[in-house]
Every structure is written in structure tokens, then in C-alpha cells.
Interface confidence: low
């Protein structure tokens, strides 16, 4: 064999014994009849040698190191050659080493031609025996970036201050090219940047520098992932350790092009993002470690790139073609923590136009799909307007307030379904009749169903909320003077199972002057709690509401008020309450701004409770809570 190294080539060749084997017969390098076990050839030297055995590959290895100095002169950038050519070298296991030294301010980029690289962990080996070991430098300290095989996703590695690349080729491997080039870049202001390119579905396992040992203190390392826009990437941490930080925090940051909240910071113990569309960067940041007990920071993670999962391949048809004046919005439900990045969660129209919010309008059939790791992050809000413009046509007309089944079949939770019920002013009023009698939600007897009806005035200038009502009570109907909104609000996913309990009919009825009339038919078993509209804010000025309370023939009703005085202070007018027996028309009138409220009273027949407000002074509002309890007449009430 003859190896001649050109002068000024900065190449050193070293042939030395490899890992010792149990071969009985030793083997030597023979030069000028001398037998040696190590041979070093420097640039400008020419050496002729042979081996003393038939299979030197079982005994020796060869290292070819080229030092590239970018400190004192220009760098030889471009495609890196294998020098000397592999055909001129003895067939030993070969390691080509390129040691590039550069200024701190210079970025160096290794570019790998296809096939790209795949990082391997400790104890792993490459199937074809070809390995790339890459290390960097922080001042005088060598930092291992990682060991890589062929056939992966790593296309580029950027470093600063210097790079050492070792390409190990087994003696039998025919490779005669390095497979990479070097380019100069501006400062990257971090230890290194590893670019990983996905052409299609696949996964990559990557590790922090020095893995499984500790990541250098207070350093920053970035991975850039290039992912086709139609695919989704998810990150999972396979193994990590945290060091003991004295200052700052160890963390990972995600940078997603186009996101308005870059960079987004996660602790290593957090659940990492999934279902990210397109390119993204992940950075690992170390901290200032405790000098006495530093511990180690290390991270091994996997990026999985795949076609969107689960619901995303399902198409849902939302048929609103027979609906009028209706809009359905699918949107993110509010989350408390808003300084955290959460992976994208999108709803798509016709599988093409994807956004975090989507509004569908009536008159069409819509095809939608979802691109979301967790559909509980979305909810639906629906609005429908039922209006009457001609009182002659609408009177006595009824409409069913039901959530259409198309909407219930969507995989997203319904939050609100609001019906806006509009009537011609001073011509018609409305009556709501539930399929199942309703209970008014109060602190004393809260609703515990999976949904409620929220009834409020829909007149812009009027701040009037009648209350929240759920199935399973004593309210048989609610009559309201003018425009209202009725919102079915769900509180639990179990609404899907309880959907059959919903059912409200609205009818247009002749106009009446009171703001609202509640018809109550109490059950003998339970206490009925009722409260004035606008609880906590007070009944609006000059508003009048009534309760029509039925008492069966064999029962007695006990009417109880829950405070001694109403608390209202009138600026103008008077606030009063009338309790009137329906059979005899006998009535008691109480001045709410002066009198104490009545003590519990017993009623043998159906009766009215009417409450009318004055114009109260601010802060002294009218809020009343009362209950009705039925007991059999046979009980001695004395």
C-alpha cells in the first residue's frame, strides 16, 4: 500500500490496532522490514507499507483526520471530499474526521444529501455500519451533538465556533463520497440547530447534546421541523431529566410560523403539543445550575408526523337548508390559561377551509370536518330568530323550540342554542309551554340537570333576565309581554342522553301589559322556590310580574317569604305586592318599600302573587325569593 498526503493538506492518517480480538496470531504493519502496530502519516509524507497477515481488517483501523482552519483564512466551503480516495486506502474500518475551527461569531452548516440522517441513542448501531458522529465546541469544551445513521430526516446541522464530523465506514462498505457539504452562516446564537425534514408520514427520535449525559449549562439547542402543510406533527418526550437550577428555568419553546404568540414555553414535564400543522421549531433551554449539586438536563423526544387523526377524516353533514334565520358557530371554548401555547384545533368546511371558528348559516347544506387533537376544546353556539311581523297571521300560532337532530349528532358539545322570539310591539305577547314542567334555578334549590333554559328580554334597552329554568319542577308555563330570547344552555356532555327531555313550545297570544306571568302547579312532594326576575340586579323600574299558583282541592299551600323586608327604596312611585285569592277575589296589598313582608300564610284555593316595582334608588333594589309548599288539608294547621 502507498499513502501520499499532499503538502499543506492538513490531513493526518493514523493506522492503529482496533478493539483487541481473541485471534491467536498477531498482525503487524510492515515498513522497511520493521514490524509496528501503529502508523502515523502527516501531510507532505509518502509511506509504503504492507501488513503481515491476510486479514488486517480484523486487527487494524484507519483514521483520516483533516483539520480545517477558518480562523486565519478563508474556509474551503462546499462539498466535502473523501481524501485520500477510499480506493487508495487499505480495506480497514475507516473513520474520516473533519475538524473545523471557526470564530465564535461564525455559523457553520453541515448539509446532508439524501439519504438524510437518523439519530441513534446510546447502545444502538446502524444497520449498514455507517455512522456519523458530530460534535461541537463551547470554548475549549467538546460537546457531542449526536450519532447518526443514514435513512432519516436530519438534513442540516448548524453550529458555531467549530464542528467535528466523524464518518465511520466499515471496511467492506463501497462508499466513496462524504455525503455532506459545509457552508458558512451568520451566528446562530446557540449551541446548534438541527433541521429535520419530513416528506411524508414518519417519525424521528432526537436527543439533546451530550445525551445521555448532561446538556451543557445555560445552553440553547434548536430543532427545526419541516412538515408538509397537510400533515400534522406531535411531540412526545420519551425520556428527560432536569438539573438543579439556581437561576432561570429549564424549558422547551415552540415557534410556529404564523402564530401570534411565539415563542410558546413549556416545562419539560408538561404534555407537549400535538396536531401541529406544518413547520415548527422546538428549542431546549438550559439554566444556571447549582454549583454544589448541578444534576443533569437531558432530553430524548419523538416527533410523529402523520395524516390528521380520528375525526378529521369524517365528514359531517349539517343540513340547514330548511331552516330560516339561523346561524351555527363552532368555536374554541374559553380556556382559563391563555399564556400557554395549545396545538391547533380547527374546524374545516368542505375539508379545505380550516379555521378555529366556523359559522354556518341557514338555507344551505354544509359539509364539515375537524382537525383537532381534542374535540372537547370546541363547542357550538346556535342562534335562531322566530319573528312575527303580522299579528293577524301569527296569533295563536305555535312553534316548537327543539335542537335539530343534525346538530346533536355533531361530535362537538352544544353550549347554547338561543331562540330570539320577536313580536309586533303592543300587539302580541308570548307564552312558553314546556314538555316537562320547569324548576326555577335558585341558590336554595339549584338545577342539577344537564341543561337549562335561560329566559331574558330581547329588547336592547331592557335589562330583564327572567331566570334559568330546568326540567323537573312546577312551572307549567311562562307568559311574557314582548320580545325574549330563550337559550338552551348545556352543562354536561350527558345532555346528548337527556336531549329527549328538552321541548318547549312558544305561542303568540294576545298582548298583555305585565312583563311576565308564571303559572305554577306545585307537586305535593316538594317545596317550590320562586324568585323575582333579574335576581341580584333587582327587578327593573316600574316592572310588574305575577305568579298564578294552583292549589288542588285537597291541599293547602303555604306561602313563605325569605326575608323580613324587601329592602327596596323608591325614588319615585311605590313598590307593592298583591296576594289575591282567585275564587273570592279577596286580596291583601303590601307596600314593599314600607311594610314588612307577610309572615307565612296558608291558602286553600288557587291564588295570585303580583309584584310591581317603583323606580328604586340605585343600590336599593327589589329582589324577592319565596316558596310554596303543599300539605294535605287533613293536617291540623293550627
Amino acid at each position: 500500500f502507498e499513502i501520499a498526503l499532499p503538502r499543506e493538506s492538513n490531513i493526518t492518517v493514523l493506522i492503529k490496532l482496533g478493539t483487541p480480538t481473541l485471534l491467536a496470531k498477531p498482525c503487524y504493519i510492515v515498513i522497511s522490514k520493521r514490524h509496528i502496530t501503529m502508523l502515523s502519516i502527516k501531510s507532505g509524507e509518502r509511506i509504503v507499507f504492507t501488513f503481515s497477515c491476510q486479514s488486517p481488517e480484523n486487527h487494524f483501523v484507519i483514521e483520516i483526520q483533516k483539520n480545517i482552519d477558518c480562523m486565519s483564512g478563508p474556509c474551503p466551503f462546499g462539498e466535502v471530499q473523501l481524501q485520500p480516495s477510499t480506493s487508495l486506502l487499505p480495506t480497514l474500518n475507516r473513520t474520516f474526521i473533519w475538524d473545523v475551527k471557526a470564530h465564535k461569531s461564525i455559523g457553520l452548516e453541515l448539509q446532508f444529501s439524501i439519504p438524510r440522517l437518523r439519530q441513534i441513542g446510546p447502545g444502538e448501531s446502524c444497520p449498514d455500519g455507517v455512522t456519523h458522529s458530530i460534535s461541537g465546541r463551547i470554548d475549549a469544551t467538546v460537546v457531542r451533538i449526536g450519532t447518526f445513521c443514514s435513512n432519516g430526516t436530519v438534513s442540516r446541522i448548524k453550529m458555531q465556533e467549530g464542528v467535528k464530523m466523524a464518518l465511520h465506514l466499515p471496511w467492506f462498505h463501497p462508499r466513496n463520497v462524504s455525503g455532506f457539504s459545509i457552508a458558512n452562516r451568520s451566528s446562530i446564537k446557540r449551541l446548534c440547530i438541527i433541521e429535520s425534514v419530513f416528506e411524508g408520514e414518519g417519525s424521528a427520535t432526537l436527543m439533546s447534546a451530550n445525551y445521555p449525559e448532561g446538556f451543557p449549562e445555560d445552553e440553547l439547542m434548536t430543532w427545526q421541523f419541516v412538515v408538509p402543510a397537510h400533515l400534522r406533527a406531535s411531540v412526545s418526550f420519551l425520556n428527560f431529566n432536569l438539573s438543579n437550577c439556581e437561576r432561570k428555568e429549564e424549558r422547551v419553546e415552540y415557534y410556529i410560523p404564523g402564530s401570534t404568540t411565539n415563542p410558546e414555553v413549556f416545562k419539560l414535564e408538561d404534555k407537549q403539543p400535538g396536531n401541529m400543522a406544518g413547520n415548527f421549531n422546538l428549542s431546549l433551554q438550559g439554566c444556571d445550575q447549582d454549583a454544589q449539586s448541578p444534576g443533569i438536563l437531558r432530553l430524548q423526544f419523538q416527533v410523529l408526523v402523520q395524516h390528521p387523526q380520528n375525526e378529521s377524516n369524517k365528514i359531517y353533514v349539517v343540513d340547514l337548508s330548511n331552516e330560516r334565520a339561523m346561524s351555527l358557530t363552532i368555536e374554541p371554548r374559553p380556556v382559563k390559561q391563555s399564556r400557554k401555547f395549545v396545538p391547533g384545533c380547527f374546524v374545516c368546511l368542505e375539508s379545505r377551509t380550516c379555521s378555529s371558528n366556523l359559522t354556518l348559516t341557514s338555507g344551505s347544506k354544509h359539509k364539515i370536518s375537524f382537525l383537532c387533537d381534542d374535540l372537547t376544546r370546541l363547542w357550538m353556539n346556535v342562534e335562531k330568530t322566530i319573528s312575527c311581523t303580522d299579528h293577524r297571521y301569527c296569533q295563536r300560532k305555535s312553534y316548537s323550540l327543539q335542537v335539530p337532530s343534525d346538530i346533536l349528532h355533531l361530535p362537538v358539545e352544544l353550549h347554547d342554542f338561543s331562540w330570539k322570539l320577536l313580536v309586533p310591539k303592543d300587539r302580541l305577547s308570548l307564552v312558553l309551554v314546556p314538555a316537562q314542567k320547569l324548576q326555577q334555578h335558585t341558590h336554595e334549590k339549584p338545577c342539577n340537570t344537564s341543561f337549562s333554559y335561560l329566559v331574558a328580554s330581547a329588547i336592547p334597552s331592557q335589562d330583564l333576565y327572567f331566570g334559568s329554568f330546568c326540567p323537573g319542577g312546577s312551572i307549567k308555563q311562562i307568559q311574557v309581554k314582548q320580545n325574549i330570547s330563550v337559550t338552551l344552555r348545556t352543562f354536561a356532555p350527558s345532555f346528548q342522553q337527556e336531549a329527549s327531555r328538552q321541548g318547549l313550545t312558544v305561542s303568540f297570544i294576545p298582548y298583555f301589559k305585565e312583563e311576565g306571568v308564571f303559572t305554577v302547579t306545585p307537586d305535593t312532594k316538594s317545596k317550590v322556590y320562586l324568585r323575582t326576575p333579574n335576581w341580584d340586579r333587582g327587578l327593573p323600574s316600574l316592572t310588574s310580574v305575577s305568579w298564578n299558583i294552583s292549589v288542588p282541592r285537597d291541599q293547602v299551600a303555604c306561602l313563605t317569604f325569605f326575608k323580613e323586608r324587601s329592602g327596596v327604596v323608591c325614588q319615585t312611585g311605590r313598590a307593592f305586592m298583591i296576594i289575591q285569592e282567585q275564587r273570592t277575589r279577596a286580596e291583601e296589598i303590601f307596600s314593599l318599600d314600607e311594610d314588612v313582608l307577610p309572615k307565612p300564610s296558608f291558602h286553600h284555593h288557587s291564588f295570585w302573587v303580583n309584584i310591581s316595582n317603583c323606580s328604586p334608588t340605585s343600590g336599593k333594589q327589589l329582589d324577592l325569593l319565596f316558596s310554596v309548599t303543599l300539605t294535605p288539608r287533613t293536617v291540623d294547621l293550627t
Epitope: L220, T261, V265, K336
Partner: antibody
Framework: EVKLVESGPGLVAPSQSLSITCTVS????????VHWVRQPPGKGLEWLVV???????TYNSALKSRLSINKDNSKSQVFLKMNSLQTDDTAMYYC?????????????WGQGTTVTVSS | DIVMTQTPASLAVSLGQRATISCRAS??????????MHWYQQKPGQPPKLLIY???NLESGIPARFSGSGSRTDFTLTINPVEADDVATYYC?????????FGGGTKLEIK
């Protein structure tokens, strides 16, 4: 269009407390944090406190014992209260929108409200 | 607290020339690969206006005459070329650690 409008009493007697309201429009308090910064006449800027979108707060430790901040998301209002005012609390008080969730810079500022501490 | 020292306190520059304002932090304001240093412009009778965020990023709508550079403790705001409309006081601010502190300001005038 993003707008922040501060409203305050103008004149406060020494040892009394100060309440200022910042009413915002064009963005939601559930998405962005709001900072308070003050500037004494002819002097530089001093950061006081921030209330984040999730309701968490970060105070300037030097003033923490005298400051309190809260907000009403539905009314798009942020309230600053400062106790035990002295003449050196005389300043222009600004509220400002947090730029991005992670930068803690301030990209939109109100016109400020002048607070004079004098008997 | 991190103390921000701005130099010079005032600066007079001819129209069309370059203005350079320095800001030095008493400790590093870098975290996680980012410098949490921002620059504001304040004209008399007006609130401050964000020019540069995170040391070198130009806020949208701000002319490219303004640029920022630096890391860790030393930062620079450069205006090149200076225009008449740039007469104002310029402040640096760090947001790496609370309390988020401002520099004392640099008043820019035209020669």
C-alpha cells in the same frame, strides 16, 4: 381599532387613596394583559403592575404593598388602586396593552390620566 | 432589580445623519435565546410608542430607519437617517425579570 382610555380623579389629597379605571376596546381582556406605568412630570417611566389575561398579577415589589389591580372582563375595564399617596406620586398614569403573551412589551398605550397629589 | 442605564441623556444630530442610543442592563436580559429588551419613542404630550421589541424586531408600522441590536447587557437603538419627525425621547425597557424596568431616556434633538 385598539384603544385604551384612563379615567381618574385628577387631584388627590396626601395620604388618601387613588382609583383609576382603564377602559379598553378593540381587544379582549381575556386574551391580553394590561400594564400600568407612571411618569412623574419631566421624568422617566416607572412600571407599576400588570394583570394578565387569566387574572394573574405581577406587581413592582417596591410598590406592591400600596397597589391593587383587578378587572371586569365583561366591561373591558381594568382598575388600579393605590393607597397612601404622597406628593412624589404626582404623575401621568398610563395603562398599556401587553404586546404578546411572552414578550411583556407594551404595544398600545392610553393617553394617560394626570394625578396630582396636593392638599 | 435590573437597572437600565441609557446613554447619552441627550443627543443632537443633523438631519440625514445617524443617531445611536445605547442602553446597558445591570445584568443579562437574555433568556431562552431571546433578548427581552424593547425600545419606545415618546413625543411631548403623548404616550410612549413601541418601536422595537425583543432587541431587534421592528414593530409593524415603524419605518425601517429604526433598528435595534445587542444581547445580554448591551443594546443599541439606531436611527439612520434621522428625520425631523424623530425628535422625541427614547426609552429602553427590559422584561426579562420583574419589575420590568425602563432606562432614564435619551432626548433626541436636531442640530
Amino acid at each position: 381599532e385598539v384603544k385604551l382610555v384612563e379615567s381618574g380623579p385628577g387631584l388627590v389629597a396626601p395620604s388618601q387613596s387613588l382609583s383609576i379605571t382603564c377602559t379598553v376596546s378593540g381587544f379582549s381582556l381575556t386574551t391580553y394583559g394590561v400594564h400600568w406605568v407612571r411618569q412623574p412630570p419631566g421624568k422617566g417611566l416607572e412600571w407599576l403592575v400588570v394583570i394578565w389575561s387569566d387574572g394573574n398579577t405581577t406587581y413592582n415589589s417596591a410598590l406592591k404593598s400600596r397597589l391593587s389591580i383587578n378587572k371586569d372582563n365583561s366591561k373591558s375595564q381594568v382598575f388600579l388602586k393605590m393607597n397612601s399617596l404622597q406628593t412624589d406620586d404626582t404623575a401621568m398614569y398610563y395603562c398599556a396593552k401587553n404586546y404578546r403573551n411572552y414578550d411583556y412589551a407594551m404595544d398600545y398605550w392610553g393617553q394617560g390620566t394626570t394625578v396630582t397629589v396636593s392638599s | 432589580d435590573i437597572v437600565m442605564t441609557q446613554t447619552p441623556a441627550s443627543l443632537a444630530v443633523s438631519l440625514g445623519q445617524r443617531a445611536t442610543i445605547s442602553c446597558r442592563a445591570s445584568e443579562s436580559v437574555d433568556s431562552y435565546g431571546n433578548s427581552f429588551m424593547h425600545w419606545y419613542q415618546q413625543k411631548p404630550g403623548q404616550p410612549p410608542k413601541l418601536l422595537i421589541y425583543r432587541a431587534s424586531n421592528l414593530e409593524s408600522g415603524i419605518p425601517a430607519r429604526f433598528s435595534g441590536s445587542g444581547s445580554r447587557t448591551d443594546f443599541t437603538l439606531t436611527i439612520n437617517p434621522v428625520e425631523a419627525d424623530d425628535v422625541a425621547t427614547y426609552y429602553c425597557q427590559q422584561s426579562n425579570e420583574d419589575p420590568y424596568t425602563f432606562g432614564g431616556g435619551t432626548k433626541l434633538e436636531i442640530k
